[in-house]
């Protein structure tokens, strides 16, 4: 068994968790996750690794001269679901009631508030971790009297005698005799979406309260990945 550093066979490759150092022309040890190359190998000495310093990390076996910086702190519309450690970047997820409007390689660049359907409109398609709520007008015989990202259109109550007919934003009002109903009273809620990983957010435009297209803010480029530092 050859110990690092060693010269590979002509046309050969270095072993797992080793890399070929062009300067030394030798196979040298990579540094494990949580560490980086402090001193590169020579023909006679192997790579010297050092621990990643505060708020920096490496997730893979590598020979980077400096660890990667953890992303900035989670913004107010996010929660930190994974702390920055030597071996992993910070992960922020959108808070309940928000979705990832602009994805990036891992997680999300921009969280946006879920659209709220205004009275007369109900949720046609609930929000997911990566898509906004879709609203639809309440069909005849149904209504929604709330501004909500979860309420669907509900059937009007059925009256023996109607005092005030219902419309898209208001339930029917019956005279004093007990109404019958096809559904139990009270708002019907759709479950909140599970958030996705996200980071580096920017302020979000106010949510639209009617069906339509959300707009996104422009954002800068994502930080460089750890490159070809895998096993």
């Amino acid at each position: 068994v050859a110990f690092t550093p060693y010269a590979p066979e002509p046309g050969g490759t270095c072993r797992l968790r080793e890399y070929y150092d062009q300067t030394a022309q030798m196979c040298c040890s990579k540094c494990p996750p949580g560490q980086h190359a402090k001193v590169f190998c020579t023909k006679t000495s192997d790579t010297v690794c050092d621990s990643c310093e505060d708020s920096t990390y490496t997730q893979l076996w590598n020979w980077v001269p400096e660890c990667l910086s953890c992303g900035s702190r989670c913004s107010s519309d996010q929660v930190e679901t994974q702390a920055c450690t030597r071996e992993q970047n910070r992960i922020c997820t959108c808070r309940p009631g928000w979705y990832c409007a602009l994805s990036k390689q891992e997680g999300c660049r921009l969280c946006a508030q879920l659209r709220k359907c205004r009275p007369g409109f109900g949720v046609a398609r609930p929000g997911t971790e990566t898509s906004d709520v879709v609203c639809k007008p309440c069909a005849p015989g149904t209504f929604s009297n709330t501004t909500s990202s979860t309420d669907i259109c509900r059937p009007h109550q059925i009256c023996h005698v109607v005092a005030i007919p219902g419309n898209a934003s208001m339930d029917a009002v019956c005279t004093s005799t007990s109404p019958t109903r096809s559904m139990a009273p009270g708002a019907v809620h759709l479950p909140q979406p599970v958030s996705t990983r996200s980071q580096h957010t920017q302020p979000t435009p106010a949510p639209s309260t009617a069906p339509g297209t959300s707009f996104l803010l422009p954002v800068g480029p994502s930080p460089p990945a750890e490159g070809s530092t895998g096993d």
Partner: antibody, heavy 118, light 106 residues
């Protein structure tokens, strides 16, 4: 409860070596990095080095290179530090401490007093 | 390596008094960490990431600062707070500790 139990006090002669231990309880040993810290005479603290049990790699404070050697025995969830060529300057309390993969020492061992005297 | 200078080295405070101790770094650091140590005991983590209190630390403690200047404050001194407090950084290898501030009760 998560604890680090260190070996008892040592009285050693100048020029000798000593190996002190730090046994971890109630956690997955390989998930935590083990640091060693020196405290001389009730004074301040000096970081000696770190061992990453998951990878078996070490990183040392330049000041303690050649003086301290860090090892682990995963089967017994124990970390060791050997101190070589002891002098009176090495008389101190030595602590093991985990860092949870972050940059501060969240759990400390009980401490081992090493006295170097002829 | 980064040198951390703590001041004062020794201070005393009466119960109920506000206490502030400082830690100055020779180069800028990302975060500061603080430990409490009492005689014949191991250091205990006290404040992490500059301002977060470790588990079990009373709310009268707080930490603040940035760059090269950091501080630990006790809003109202209590007898059990008498101890030595050490600051620590790991923004640069090797991690280093301050020389400590010994806080006594009057």
């Amino acid at each position: 409860e998560f604890q680090l139990q260190q070996s008892g006090p040592e009285l050693v002669k100048p020029g000798a070596s000593v190996k002190i231990s730090c046994k971890a309880s109630s956690y997955s040993f390989t998930d935590y990095n083990m640091n060693w810290v020196k405290q001389s005479n009730g004074k301040s603290l000096e970081w000696i080095g770190i061992i990453f049990p998951k990878y078996g790699t070490t990183s040392y404070n330049q000041k303690f290179k050649g003086k301290a050697t860090l090892t682990v025995d995963q089967s017994s969830s124990t970390a060791y530090m050997q101190l070589n060529s002891l002098t009176s300057e090495d008389s101190a309390v030595y602590y093991c401490a985990t860092d949870g993969g972050t940059w501060y020492f969240d759990v400390w061992g009980t401490g081992t007093t090493v006295t170097v005297s002829s | 390596q980064i040198v951390l200078t703590q001041s004062p080295a020794l201070m005393s405070a009466s119960p109920g008094e506000k206490v502030t101790m400082t830690c100055s770094a020779s180069s800028s650091v990302t975060y500061m960490y603080w430990y409490q140590q009492k005689p014949r005991s191991s250091p205990k983590p006290w404040i992490y990431l500059t301002s977060n209190l470790a588990s079990g630390v009373p709310a009268r403690f707080s930490g603040s600062g940035s760059g090269t200047s950091y501080s630990l404050t006790i809003s109202s001194m209590e007898a059990e707070d008498a101890a030595t407090y050490y600051c620590q950084q790991w923004s640069s290898n090797p991690p280093t500790f301050g020389s400590g501030t010994k806080l006594e009760i009057k």
